[in-house]
């Protein structure tokens, strides 16, 4: 029977900068029941606080609701593991909520084949940012990535769209049914999941761009 091994806070995520959750990985339990507590203080403060919510994020997590979440302030947190034989502490983790946003996928993905008379045909893809993200304040810059592939193909073709919410693709295989998805990430944050796939049938007379 031993004191617990050193835990590690390995991930923090926020859907929208208004709330966030951090997760830790327990060390060895030393063969004894072990209690975990997360404590934190904000940059420039000395007063330590305990995790306000160990439930919402699931096992080995701490959730910070709206009233506990401040932007532009670094949180300095650590996890304490305790059993009958002693304690161990994780390394301190410095967290700025602005940098841990993982948004929901983009919405309203629309895909259309455009065949203008005077120009080459193209696939036109359009989407909207996720609803929880407030782009109007200027706090967020969202970057987008599109992936598409013929239905039976193994490999995805990936296009980086930058900040725009529409995109044109010229090189496609005529007569094929394509899957199209889009995802987004803040400039310093994490990629969202891919949006649900939208299917589009490319006409047989679609002229491949060289």
């Amino acid at each position: 029977q031993l004191p617990p091994g050193k835990p590690e806070i390995f991930k923090c995520r926020s859907p929208n900068k208004e709330t966030f959750t951090c997760w830790w990985r327990p060390g060895t339990d030393g063969g004894l029941p072990t209690n975990y507590s997360l404590t934190y203080h904000r940059e420039g403060e000395t007063l330590m606080h305990e995790c306000p919510d160990y439930i919402t994020g699931g096992p080995n997590s701490c959730h910070f609701g709206k009233q506990y979440t401040s932007m532009w302030r670094t949180y300095i947190m650590m996890v304490n593991a305790t059993n009958q034989m002693g304690s161990s502490f994780s390394d301190e983790l410095y967290v700025d909520v602005t940098y841990i946003v993982q948004p929901d996928p983009p919405l309203e993905l629309a895909v259309e084949v455009k065949q203008p008379e005077d120009r080459k045909p193209y696939l036109w893809i359009k989407w909207s940012p996720p609803t929880l993200i407030d782009l109007k304040t200027g706090w967020f810059t969202l970057l987008y990535e599109i992936r598409l592939k013929p239905e039976k193909a193994a490999e995805w073709e990936i296009h980086f769209a930058g900040q725009q919410t529409e995109f044109k693709i010229l090189s496609l295989h005529p007569g094929q049914k394509y899957l199209v998805q889009v995802r987004c990430k803040p400039d310093h944050g994490y990629w969202s999941a891919w949006s649900p796939a939208t299917f589009i049938q490319i006409p047989s007379d679609f002229t491949m761009n060289d």
Partner: antibody
Framework: EVQLVQSGAEVKKPGSSVKVSCKAS????????MHWVRQAPGQGLEWIGE????????NYNQKFKDRATLTVDKSTSTAYMELSSLRSEDTAVYYC?????????????WGQGTLVTVSS | DIQMTQSPSSVSASVGDRVTITCKAS??????VAWYQQKPGKAPKLLIY???NRYTGVPSRFSGSGSGTDFTLTISSLQPEDFATYYC?????????FGGGTKVEIK
Amino acid sequence: EVQLVQSGAEVKKPGSSVKVSCKASGYTFTTYWMHWVRQAPGQGLEWIGEIDPSDSYSNYNQKFKDRATLTVDKSTSTAYMELSSLRSEDTAVYYCARNGGLGPAWFSYWGQGTLVTVSS
Amino acid sequence: DIQMTQSPSSVSASVGDRVTITCKASQYVGTAVAWYQQKPGKAPKLLIYSASNRYTGVPSRFSGSGSGTDFTLTISSLQPEDFATYYCQQYSSYPWTFGGGTKVEIK
């Protein structure tokens, strides 16, 4: 204990490429951005770029955009910096440096440095 | 690119002295400034982040201040192990840039 262990010194010819490795241990590799910084002999520090090991998303100093490539191997917790079209001015100590936290780009852990000498 | 201009480039001081190093940014960087200490043949070591916050384990004799474009690192009572080169760094906008360094030498 957090450690960043870099590959050994290299001597390269002008026009060639060099690939420096940085093996991380003591923490979850995918949690923190990794940066690369260089220091020419007797000179100051110059940031080359950064990579997020969780998804290989990277940002570069425009000065190095066309010549530097940052990659990671998650299976071995190793970051790499490749610099191509080497010239004598690229002679420097190259450091990998781990982001201080889940936040802005200040660097709390550094590798020991790798001296790259470019000479004909 | 944001230029970080450090002064002085070198300073001679004695153990126990108060040493002040300044760093001026060419444009507004808020408090997005870090300070590092580097000894010959070694990697830099983080001292201060967010202009004024001491990093874990850094002695209290090191302090940082400033915001906007003007920043200061102060060593309140110089110790023998503090003779080194000090660098400021801005992380407000890409590319992240460093000052030219200030060498603190023994008088």
